[in-house]
């Protein structure tokens, strides 16, 4: 931002009213008036070039310094060419001297040269030659000097003529301020420029109304240079929640809009399934029946729990059930749907029911399922099971109602035994099997059926209470089809797979484990 100039003295603007002190009185510098465009132009001039030893002084009135530390002095003046005068006037000069003196009081007409300190010799860039002067084409020069730091209450400037032909048309004394500034939503106060060129005054900014320094951000600061320019901005402010940046201010979000945190973003329109927000909203309330999960951003539409799984089937396979379902028809507007499966078993005789989580086995953990199927095994035969599949999403915990579907299945058979060949010889096969422990108590006996492969007319049956049997009197090097079935009080359980086992050939006799 451009520096602001605060004028302490302006001779040209004063219209000849300042009454500066001349020394010696009337013989050197004197005030003159000229009319240009019907306006009086005043100047202090001196032109005693033909007389040697000139020492003419012009002193300003006392200037109150105020808050200035460094002052700038702008001079506008003309200087006539010494060659305009006979013989170049040996005593003629083309420069004058600028002085200043600081003081805490106005000395009035008590002028003492010794109190003044020279600032500089002022030389023109262009001199006015005789022909230009007579044609009224004077060459106006502009020179600027600065002085600082100043410490006293006020000061005088003085101009010493040592034999030049000078007209001083403008003397402007000012100091510089960095102007009041709004930048990055921070307000920086008008600040007096420092007096030392290398130094930069650090100035703290204050956030404009409804703006804040973002968490972890730097407080706004700028640097006021000696020339009144703001430099090196650091940090910034952001419009707080519920407000957005409009030009250099923070304006409340309009009704129907919101902003949930301090950021550079504009206010956003309230998302779906929210109520119209008031002015300056930081979020938009959800419509009735819709919710926002704690981790949901405020920009996300409000959502609701899902409906129940759409379609649920329970397919029994012995002592296993495969549950399958389809996703809810209404997801509630969310994608974070998970499923929970719970199990209840009922005894047909007593009608008593209870949870069965401890006695069954799931193909994967039954809570937080993301797939739409699960297999439940280790079910007891001749038991009624009810399975509940509940659909949940991120807002289900915010309501008391649940979205679920149930399926019931009766287990009438035990699970098929798992059969192994333990050993064989040329005339025997040793077979063992297993079923889940919960079902074992319901088994009365096991029935082993076997026959030669390819002979569909005859088969043999052996019954046993144990978990193994040796089948004797078999033909060597022959394949037998073997199946094991559990027998319960209520009837037959599920049969095992039909296994093919082969006896050894006579060359390799002996009871070998397989």
């Amino acid at each position: 931002a451009q520096g602001k100039e605060v004028v302490l003295l302006d001779f040209a603007a004063a219209g000849g009213e300042l009454g500066w002190l001349t020394h010696p009185y009337g013989k050197g510098w004197d005030l003159m008036q000229n009319i240009m465009n019907d306006m009086p132009i005043y100047m202090y001039s001196v032109c005693n070039v033909m007389s040697g030893d000139q020492d003419n002084w012009l002193r300003t009135n006392w200037v109150y310094r105020g808050e200035a530390e460094r002052i700038f002095i702008e001079l506008k003046f003309t200087v006539r060419d010494c060659n305009s005068f006979p013989g170049g006037a040996s005593s003629c000069k083309e420069t004058f001297n600028l002085y200043y003196a600081e003081s805490d009081l106005d000395y009035g007409t008590n002028f003492q040269k010794r109190l003044f300190t020279k600032i500089d010799t002022i030389a023109p860039d262009e001199i006015t030659v005789s022909s230009d002067f007579e044609a009224r084409h004077v060459k106006l020069n502009v020179e600027e000097r600065s002085v600082g730091p100043l410490t006293r209450k006020g000061f005088y400037l003085a101009f010493q003529d040592i034999g030049a032909c000078v007209a001083l048309l403008s003397v402007r004394v000012y100091y510089k301020k960095c102007p009041e500034l709004l930048q990055g939503l921070a307000h920086f106060p008008e600040t007096i420029a420092g007096s030392d060129a290398p130094s930069l005054a650090t100035v703290a900014g204050t956030c404009v109304d409804h703006a804040v320094v973002p968490p972890g951000g730097e407080e706004p600061r700028m640097h006021c240079a000696v020339d009144g320019e703001w430099l090196v901005p650091i940090g910034q402010c952001l419009c707080q929640a519920g407000y957005e940046k409009v030009e250099d201010a923070c304006q409340a979000c309009s009704p129907g809009f919101f902003k949930f945190e301090a950021s550079e973003s504009p206010c956003l329109e309230c998302p779906e399934h929210t109520l119209p927000s008031p002015e300056g909203a930081t979020s938009c309330e959800c419509e009735e029946g819709f919710f926002r999960a704690p981790q949901d951003p405020a920009s996300m539409p409000c959502t609701r729990p899902p409906s129940a799984p759409h379609y649920l089937t329970a397919v029994g396979m012995g002592a296993k059930v495969e549950l399958r379902w389809t996703p809810p028809q209404d997801s509630g507007g969310r994608e974070d749907i998970v499923y929970s499966v719970t199990c209840e078993q009922c005894w047909p005789e007593s009608g008593e029911c209870g949870p069965c989580e401890a006695s069954v086995r799931y193909s994967e953990p039954p809570h937080g399922l993301t797939r739409t199927s699960v297999t439940v095994s280790d079910l007891e035969p001749h038991m009624n099971y009810t399975f509940t599949v509940e659909a949940r999403n991120g807002v289900s915990g915010l309501v008391t109602s649940r979205s679920f579907r149930t399926a019931s299945v009766s287990i009438n058979q035990t699970e098929p035994p798992k059969v192994r060949l333990e050993g064989r010889s040329t005339t025997s096969l040793s077979v063992s099997w297993s079923i889940p422990p919960p079902q074992q108590s319901r088994v009365w006996k096991y029935e082993v059926t076997y026959r030669k492969k390819g002979d569909s007319n005859s088969y043999n049956v052996r019954r046993t209470e144990g978990f193994s049997v040796t089948l004797d009197d078999l033909a060597p090097d022959t394949t037998y089809l073997v199946q094991v079935q559990a027998l319960t009080q209520e009837g037959q359980g599920a049969g095992s797979k039909v296994h093919e086992f082969q006896t050894l050939s006579p060359e390799g006799s002996g009871n070998l484990a397989v």
Epitope: Y25, G26, D30, M32, Q33, I35, N48, M50, S51, F85
Partner: antibody, heavy 120, light 108 residues
Framework: QVQLVQSGGGLVQPGGSLRLSCAAS????????MHWVRQAPGKGLEWVTV????????YYADSVKGRFTISRDNSKNTLYLQMNSLRAEDTAVYYC?????????????WGQGTLVTVSS | SELTQPPSVSVAPGQTVTITCQGD??????ASWYQQKPGTAPKLLIY???NRPSGVPDRFSGSSSGTSASLTITGAQAEDEADYYC????????????FGGGTKLTVL
């Protein structure tokens, strides 16, 4: 209106004294340098003396230096010329005049003039 | 330092007349011009480069060149018959301000 009204002229013997007055009105008297200019009978104008607006600075023509004293009373808006050791060659019409700017003029307002005759 | 004027000049009514003023001071400072009619105080006509106080007819104008200054009356009138004086600051330091000897203008 802006004007200067003079008084105090008359006949005086050589070596005598006379005090001329010039009453100002219609302008801020204390802001202007004031001059006395004289004109001997049938002759041209001759500058005599000047006083600064605050009265601190004065300057005289060589012909009157040491004999004449210019002074002013800004509270009374009046300019004075005290003439001592008068000579015959001081006989003239004396005009008070206002310097419109600065110390040296131009002289934009003049009094009506007062005749001083030095004769025995 | 002195300013020199011709003692007299004459002009026919309606004609243009120029009164000159010579002097070293005029190299450094502008001349002022005064008109004085018999029995009255002088009246300022021209000052500075060529400035006329209000009330002075625009037939009066001033100019300067080197050591010379001029007062020109364009279309002289009978009431312009008077004595005319030039005046300037003194650049020599001898005097503060100097007057020319005066020029009697006669309008024929």
């Amino acid at each position: 209106q802006v004007q200067l009204v003079q008084s105090g002229g008359g006949l005086v013997q050589p070596g005598g004294s006379l005090r001329l007055s010039c009453a100002a009105s219609g302008f801020t008297f204390s802001s202007y340098a004031m001059h006395w200019v004289r004109q001997a009978p049938g002759k041209g104008l001759e500058w005599v003396t000047v006083i600064s607006p605050d009265g601190h600075n004065t300057y005289y023509a060589d012909s009157v230096k040491g004999r004449f004293t210019i002074s002013r009373d800004n509270s009374k808006n009046t300019l004075y010329l005290q003439m001592n050791s008068l000579r015959a060659e001081d006989t003239a019409v004396y005009y008070c005049a206002r310097a419109s700017v600065g110390a040296t003029g131009p002289f934009d307002i003049w009094g009506q003039g007062t005749l001083v005759t030095v004769s025995s | 330092s002195e300013l020199t004027q011709p003692p007299s000049v004459s002009v026919a009514p309606g004609q243009t007349v120029t009164i000159t003023c010579q002097g070293d001071s005029l190299r450094s400072y502008y001349a002022s011009w005064y008109q004085q009619k018999p029995g009255t105080a002088p009246k300022l006509l021209i000052y500075g480069e060529n400035n006329r106080p209000s009330g002075v007819p625009d037939r009066f104008s001033g100019s300067s060149s080197g050591t010379s200054a001029s007062l020109t009356i364009t279309g002289a009138q009978a009431e312009d018959e008077a004595d005319y004086y030039c005046n300037s600051r003194d650049s020599s330091g001898t005097h503060l301000t100097v007057f020319g000897g005066g020029t009697k203008l006669t309008v024929l």
